[in-house]
């Protein structure tokens, strides 16, 4: 066959679906690789072809669209499973072609089993709720396009294994789950089960997401430098090791990049000739506030090093902060036999 633009295996889109549930999978070509949509391609005379490679096999084979009850079908740029089976797992390829043009991409599809409490190897999306922020909602994800708007599904929400009924601050409202005032105790996995009829059959869609309660923007402040501070003086003799921690607290801020860095005489440590090492550690609170520590270390400090300015800097979306460490050279203790004896009038 003639050359085909092969985008390879798109592992970025690792698609996971539950066994024995409907799944609709759009051909990634139109979403991520080509600059035109399916309608444009179709009206230009291009045909979309699907095939697959079973798990642990190398052989590409056509997808059987003649299964009982149309279990697998294609509609425009969507591949449908009504429902999936465990052995549907494999790499699926969609190819767009005519006599002069060809483009294809493969993607992995994994059919996953779940237990009665919805536990599974499925990678769960995380939804962050602000602590004590007022009413916030999560929406049952990825259910669009499964049934027409005329169909009214039933939706049941669960927290972990338990159906959400008469919960203090969590209220199911159809496709939405409302949190009246989110608390740490609301952390956990939430599952919506959407049940709908189609052609005399009943289908279930199970969607689980992780809720993580995080610090509220109402409480967010610029970074706070705990160290260095005004109370600690780094007094060293030449030849000793100088260790200065820069410890910074960051409020949780959605999509904020937290940065900590040292400057020595106004320059980044990489840009100066002294032998300095920086070690960083990061810890998080239950609400994802962050504490970063960068320890500046000079193994054998010189008297010149003890005259330099060591400044800890930090920045988040809320602002920039800086604090200079108090570094000085230790005045050597007098040697008794010479200095003190002279002081007592010895000659």
């Amino acid at each position: 066959s003639e050359r085909c633009d092969d985008w390879g295996l798109d592992t970025m889109r690792q698609i996971q679906v539950f066994e024995d549930e409907p799944a609709r999978i759009k051909c990634p070509l139109f979403e991520h690789f080509l600059k035109f949509n399916y309608s444009t391609a179709h009206s230009a005379g291009l045909t979309l072809i699907w095939y697959w490679t079973r798990q642990d096999r190398d052989l590409e084979e056509p997808i059987n669209f003649r299964l009982p009850e149309n279990r697998i079908s294609k509609e425009k740029d969507v591949l449908w499973f009504r429902p999936t089976l465990l052995n549907d797992t494999g790499n699926y390829t969609c190819m767009l072609r005519n006599t002069t043009y060809c483009s294809k991409v493969a993607f992995p599809l994994e059919v996953v089993q779940k237990d009665s409490c919805f536990n599974s190897p499925m990678k769960l999306p995380v939804h962050k709720l602000y602590i004590e922020y007022g009413i916030q909602r999560i929406t049952c994800p990825n259910v669009d396009g499964y049934f027409p708007s005329s169909v009214k599904p039933t939706i049941t929400w669960y927290m972990g294994c338990y159906k959400i009924q008469n919960f203090n601050n969590v209220i199911p409202e159809g496709m939405n789950l409302s949190f009246l005032i989110a608390l740490i105790s609301n952390n956990g996995n939430y599952t919506c089960v959407v049940t709908y009829p189609e052609n005399g059959r009943t289908f279930h869609l199970t969607r689980t997401l992780t809720v993580k309660v995080v610090g509220s923007p109402k409480n967010a402040v610029p970074p706070v430098i705990h160290s260095p501070n005004d109370h600690v003086v780094y007094e060293k003799e030449p030849g000793e090791e100088l260790l200065i921690p820069c410890t910074v607290y960051f409020s949780f801020l959605m999509d904020s990049r937290n940065e900590v860095w040292w400057t020595i005489d106004g320059k980044k440590p990489d840009d100066i000739t002294i032998d300095v090492t920086i070690n960083e550690s990061i810890s998080h609170s239950r609400t994802e506030d962050e504490t970063r520590t960068q320890i500046l270390s000079i193994k054998k400090v010189t008297s010149e090093d003890l005259k330099r300015s060591y400044v800890c800097h930090a920045r988040s979306a809320k602002g920039e902060v800086a604090k200079a460490a108090k570094v000085k050279q230790k005045v050597p203790a007098p040697r008794y036999t010479v200095e003190l004896a002279c002081g007592f009038g010895a000659t």
Epitope: P222, D230, V321, A322
Partner: antibody, heavy 116, light 110 residues
Amino acid sequence: SVEESGGRLVTPGTPLTLTCTVSGFSLDSYAMGWVRQAPGKGLEWIGIINSYGSIYYASWAKGRFTISKTSTTVDLKMTSLTTEDTATYFCARSAYSNNGDRLHLWGQGTLVTVSS
Amino acid sequence: DIVMTQTPSPVSGAVGGTVTIKCQASEDIYSNLAWYQQKPGQPPKLLIYYVSTLESGVPSRFKGSRSGTDYTLTISDLESADAATYYCQCTEGGSGSDYTFGGGTEVVVK
């Protein structure tokens, strides 16, 4: 930008409030300081308010000067004014949230004249 | 309170030459020192902070250094535009009284 206003001629003992209006940035992210300069004299530190709302005053200013802020203004309230308080009052923004170690954006100043 | 003592004033230098301004703190203020330049009728302009860090846009002819409680601002390749009064400022920061300015040093460019 930062712009001071409220400076005028007042008699001794009169209270006066100066306002520093900021635009293009949020006071939630920057410390703001007040500095004054008597005619022909040097700069004199008055005080600072950082982004967390902590306020620090020069020892000579404590009790007579009060710094406060709203979302877009920083006020300097002065009481018991004397002729020694005649000066141009500057408002300045720090590059940092936590301190006035780097006052890099200054207003043009507002003149306060205390005279009987 | 920390006292900042600036010397000498005035100081003069020729175009292309070098001038040195000294500032002494009454106690150890470590790296907490800034330098400002002020011209008549204008607000101060930050030149250097944390002893030796140049504010962006300030030419590298301006250099700050420290030895104990003595701080120095050196201006090399002097230009006529450098004629101004220069102030050191303690930025010790623990309390408001620790943001004291020095008395200022006038630089005359001949």
